[in-house]
Amino acid sequence: SGVFQLQLQEFINERGVLASGRPCEPGCRTFFRVCLKHFQAVVSPGPCTFGTVSTPVLGTNSFAVRDDSSGGGRNPLQLPFNFTWPGTFSLIIEAWHAPGDDLRPEALPPDALISKIAIQGSLAVGQNWLLDEQTSTLTRLRYSYRVICSDNYYGDNCSRLCKKRNDHFGHYVCQPDGNLSCLPGWTGEYCQQPICLSGCHEQNGYCSKPAECLCRPGWQGRLCNECIPHNGCRHGTCSTPWQCTCDEGWGGLFCDQDLNYCTHHSPCKNGATCSNSGQRSYTCTCRPGYTGVDCELELSECDSNPCRNGGSCKDQEDGYHCLCPPGYYGLHCEHSTLSCADSPCFNGGSCRERNQGANYACECPPNFTGSNCEKKVDRCTSNPCANGGQCLNRGPSRMCRCRPGFTGTYCELHVSDCARNPCAHGGTCHDLENGLMCTCPAGFSGRRCEVRTSIDACASSPCFNRATCYTDLSTDTFVCNCPYGFVGSRCEFPVGLPPSFPW
């Protein structure tokens, strides 16, 4: 669709005569008829296939034509067409004399024609005017013409329809050739796809308007590139949504079981060495001079009764010192100047001569030891208590004070963690070396089956058209991540293309 425009500029008829040679009385009141038709090698009469237009009387004899409306007519003259411009044309311009006000052909005398010109040729669509001048024996006509496209039509032939828009169906303006030029922030064949925030993750993010990044379920962050771990995940991470991959030193479904108590809590005191021995379980190896489960108690060096033969021990800053009884000497009073005659054996020990009476040895009754039977037996020296139990001397016997979770004479027995039925909702309890584990029935989870969980909403494959299904644990629902070209809560609808254009 377009318009052929003809601009009449000047008509010269100095003698004021008709084509027949007869003069006009009083002068030639001149109007024009224009016929636009398809290209003819020889322009001949016949239908004006591209259109016709007439002017009012524009002047008498010789006159210039103004560029605007003149007496109700328009200059340039408009010859609209509703087809593809063919690039060639034929044009007939007739100048007529109007004796009266009625300009209809049937109202004019047959010899009212002043002049007639006919041209033909090629004409491309464009903004530039082509100037022409046609001269006959008695008249001269100067004019210019061009073809331009109607609004919203573009291209070499005015055949491409393009109407700028900024709505749901597209966001674009039109280029001179009729191609779409997307508005900033939009892309796609019809400029319907927003360009998301720069860096927005292709799969995990999307946008409904330019420069935004909306996250699909299970993802977060400015660019939707950080997954959200399983709800309840404490010391874990994820690489896909709702995972819970435990950090080092943590275990369990929610990574909330401490497998590295030593590092996380540093329970051993006074430079002791800590060894992990299971969930929340550890053993401290004390440095010399310290004791207790956490090596929190300072030992006196005299506590080990280093002085023999009844020697008394004195603590010193750099160790200890033995004060020996009469008849004994040495660092620990271990050397004797006595014989059996001096009755050196205490606590009912019996004396035996050695080396022809130069020395002796004491045979001690039960519960006593030492070269002179002077020491009560410390039944805790062999560390008989297992699992970190504390050994206590009780007269002639000993006993073990056990840590929580252990029992038995030597703390060698685990207390059954399952005895108190810790698993909720009918969970099955299993005793483990370092604690317990619950096997939960369907619909429950958690360390003690205390969390009611939904059945996997994606199990029924609710998404169509190869969409990816995510279970949103926070709402017990599924969400479908649609591939390009599909919409709907289950990706069941293909995206409708916008109304088709004429090209």
Epitope: L197, L214, P229
Partner: nanobody, 123 residues
Framework: EVQLVESGGGLVQPGGSLRLSCAAS????????MSWVRQAPGKGPEWVSA????????YYADSVKGRFTISRDNAKNTLYLQMNSLKPEDTAVYYC????????????????WGQGTQVTVSS
């Protein structure tokens, strides 16, 4: 049930300070990015600040940059907003929320919301 409960709002003079808190429950707080959003009377919601799940990355709207500080304590399931050098234009209801969509300047779509706490800056 997810709950976000804001507190710490009140009336303060221009130039004064307030510290807002948001206590979270019903979800694993430490796994989620968090945000503060405010809504002044007769206006739409305006993003104020955001912080990532670990607390290492913080974001601020231009209007509060240098005056407000966002922080979180994942052990206490609590989000904070320290507001200094307050101005009358900071008067609004302040909400904490979990962002699920970002624009060029900050979050603009949210999942969970609190009920809000009123902050009034007036002499």
């Amino acid at each position: 049930e997810v709950q976000l409960v804001e507190s710490g709002g009140g009336l303060v003079q221009p130039g004064g300070s307030l510290r807002l808190s948001c206590a979270a429950s019903g979800f694993t707080f430490g796994n989620y990015d968090m945000s503060w959003v405010r809504q002044a009377p007769g206006k739409g919601p305006e993003w104020v600040s955001a912080i990532n799940s670990g607390g290492g990355d913080t974001y601020y709207a231009d209007s509060v940059k240098g005056r407000f500080t966002i922080s979180r304590d994942n052990a206490k399931n609590t989000l904070y907003l320290q507001m200094n050098s307050l101005k009358p234009e900071d008067t609004a209801v302040y909400y904490c929320a979990t962002p699920r969509g970002w624009g060029p300047t900050g979050p603009h779509e949210y999942g969970y919301w609190g009920q809000g706490t009123q902050v009034t800056v007036s002499s």
